[in-house]
Interface confidence: medium
Amino acid sequence: GSERTCCPVNWVEHERSCYWFSRSGKAWADADNYCRLEDAHLVVVTSWEEQKFVQHHIGPVNTWMGLHDQNGPWKWVDGTDYETGFKNWRPEQPDDWYGHGLGGGEDCAHFTDDGRWNDDVCQRPYRWVCETELDKASQEPPLL
């Protein structure tokens, strides 16, 4: 099979997922495409534990995650349910909740310097984090 049993070189394994942390900046869509080309997606944060792990690795730097509201409602790029899921917004954020073109047009979410989330203009060149899940039940042993 083509199951992934260990993380690629330069990726960090944590709780059955692999993470890659950029050191350069891209617009959200470019970061999104970059992760796709790695068979991954922008990071989807589902718990406090994962939040703390990512925060530890990115430091106090604005960093894109896989959360956007480019069509109205907030959506995680991997389909994880937003409404019932983990959230860590800064106070008063997100401040463009309702609109395309009616407010500030801030449609993409990022980690801020303190780790809490903010929505911002999608074309700002922030760092980003890719995530890909290790297969839960691999049919093959890892190659030695």
Epitope: R36, Q70, N71, G101, L102, G103, C122, Q123
Partner: antibody, heavy 118, light 106 residues
Amino acid sequence: QVQLVESGGGVVQPGRSLRLSCAASGFTFSNYGMHWVRQAPGKGLEWVAIIWFDGSNEYYADSVKGRFTISRDNSMSTLYLQMNSLRAEDTAVYYCARESGSYALYIWGQGTMVTVSS
Amino acid sequence: SYELTQPLSVSAALGQTARITCGGNNIGRKNVHWYQQKPGQSPVLIIHRDSDRPSGIPERFSGSNSGNTATLTISRAQAGDEADYYCQVWDSGTAVFGGGTKLPVL
């Protein structure tokens, strides 16, 4: 409501120049990337150029690179396309469009016709 | 440069389902957007990021994307759906459109 209105089209001779404008209203213009797209008579859509929300980045189609320049005035909520060394194959309806964040063209203007003919 | 291939025409019977394909090398790794253009009108974004519908677009319009093919599906086709449909991706600093597909509703 959200609106984009193009102007500046017309008939021009080959080798001459023309500047198109796109007036935006109903949204915070300075927060969005903007595109130009054209459509020759009876043909499909052809992307022309994009400019970042703050003017810091521009990309062009190979067919217009070195001849066309995209620019914007955020204080006037206006997008421009300066077209130099025009050719007959540049004849088309030119649309401006607002970026959505994933390089989708979320809002389109009504278009302005440019005819390059001697 | 990246190329997108669409059929020139796809027909649909009134009330039936139409599927318009957009082929490209590993297109499943890209974000695909779809536009509808009626005669004499500007294009309208109908599907964004493979399968998201902008507000105001009927649920009859849906999209999928994997492998080398993205697909726009129009369920319960109506006379008002007659239009040209274009797919679009972003690749290496340029936006790329497919050649367009004409949809007559019979």
